[in-house]
């Protein structure tokens, strides 16, 4: 379970049309459910239930985004559909280049993600918790444009990694 170094860049536009970027660094773990690879893309927050569309003819997103899923407490979920492995797979099927799970409220998801090694996804599946998860969700919940870059080695300078 290697460390995943995640950089999140938030784009804040000003009334003049310019924008400012804010870079936040956080760490997670690569799970055995996916590959230990670098990945980058615009963040799309995915509601856990939204991943379980009963209709198989669902719309696909454009390829190359990073899905962020905040997992709920499993005991009280009224309609559990996909397991956490299923959620990761569905996100990748729908075009995610990586998936990041906030497991703070569902720590048992860590074991589930690390049991899924028989047929791992070819894209990274990362989990975050605690202060790192709070930082990530604070950015995601702003509902502004943000990009994430996931690496398996510490980043050098943030400016090296984003083509603005």
């Amino acid at each position: 379970k290697e460390t995943a170094f995640v950089e999140v860049v938030l784009f804040e536009s000003s009334p003049s049309g310019d924008y400012t970027t804010y870079t936040t660094g956080l760490t997670g773990r690569f799970s055995r459910a996916g590959a230990t690879l670098s990945a980058e893309g615009e963040i799309v927050q995915m509601h856990p239930l939204g991943l379980c569309n009963n209709n198989d003819e669902e719309d696909l997103y454009e390829y190359g985004w990073v899905g962020v899923v905040k997992l709920e407490q499993p005991e009280l979920d009224p309609k559990p559909c996909l397991t956490v492995l299923g959620k990761a797979k569905r996100a990748v099927q729908r075009g995610a280049t990586a998936v990041i799970f906030d497991v703070s409220e569902n720590p048992e998801a860590i074991d589930q993600l690390n049991q899924g090694s028989e047929d791992p996804l070819k894209r990274p599946v990362v989990y975050v918790k605690g202060a790192d998860a709070i930082k990530l969700m604070n950015i995601v919940n702003k509902q502004k444009v943000a990009r994430a870059r996931i690496q398996h080695r510490p980043p050098r300078q943030p400016t090296e990694y984003f083509d603005m």
């Epitope: 379980c52 009963n54 499993p74 005991e75 009280l76 979920d77 009224p78 309609k79 559990p80 559909c81 996909l82 397991t83 956490v84 492995l85 299923g86 797979k89 569905r90 048992e108 074991d111 589930q112 049991q115 899924g116």
Partner: antibody
């Protein structure tokens, strides 16, 4: 094609136990929760509980916590429900259904009679 | 637990007729309402999820609507195979609960 194939009807004695199976195919077993639903003769549907096939963790409603034991066998893609201390109240058809309740088994009739 | 009240319990109707089945929740369920059809042989077929979304393969004569606590299933023009049982189900809060069912009968 997603299929949930349940075991056949059972005639059992009061006080005994019965274990019914739900063999799945057409999808990755560990990707979806598996749910169980009860239907008594000429009555409505009651959700019993669910199992996560990855780790075997279960959640059941209070009424079934001591009555039903849910298990899953990843090697055969099969889920099981064992019902214990059977009474006439347990005479019913039991359905397994995949997470999202979009695919259902054909049902297993359990008749409790002496 | 949220109680689901379906009405009517029995609904006599004719071929080609348009019918509506109602389902009321004991508290708001924010559109988390599904409809199922149960055939005479016991087979259960999902029809509609999240109030108004048709499952794959379900004929377009079926439609769902509603909000808050009140929801309905409408069948536009009844076909012979439609005369069977229908159930609503909420999955807004744990545990998921079903209505008692509506039997659609040939008049």
């Amino acid at each position: 094609e997603v299929l949930l194939q349940q075991s056949g009807a059972e005639l059992v004695r009061p006080g005994s136990s019965v274990k019914i199976s739900c063999k799945t195919s057409g999808y990755t077993f560990t990707d979806y929760y598996l749910h169980w639903v009860k239907q008594r003769p000429e009555q409505g549907l009651v959700w019993i509980g669910r199992i996560n096939p990855i780790n075997g963790k279960t959640v059941c409603i209070e009424k079934f916590k001591t009555k039903a034991t849910l298990t899953a066998d990843k090697s055969s893609n099969t889920a099981y429900m064992e019902l214990s201390s059977l009474t006439s109240e347990d005479t019913a058809t039991y359905f397994c259904t995949r997470g999202g309740l979009a695919y259902w088994g054909q049902g297993t009739l359990v008749t409790v009679s002496s | 637990d949220i109680q689901m009240t379906q009405s009517p319990s029995s609904l006599p109707a004719s071929l080609g007729e348009r019918v509506t089945i109602s389902c009321r929740a004991s508290q708001g369920i924010s559109n988390n309402l599904n409809w199922y059809q149960q055939k005479p042989d016991g087979t259960i077929k999902p029809l509609i999820y999240y109030t108004s979304n048709l499952q794959s393969g379900v004929p377009s004569r079926f439609s769902g609507s509603g909000s808050g606590t009140d929801y309905s299933l409408t069948i536009g023009s009844l076909e012979p195979e439609d005369f069977t049982m229908y159930y609503c189900q909420q999955d807004a809060s744990f545990p998921p609960t079903f209505g008692a069912g509506t039997k659609l009968e040939l008049k």
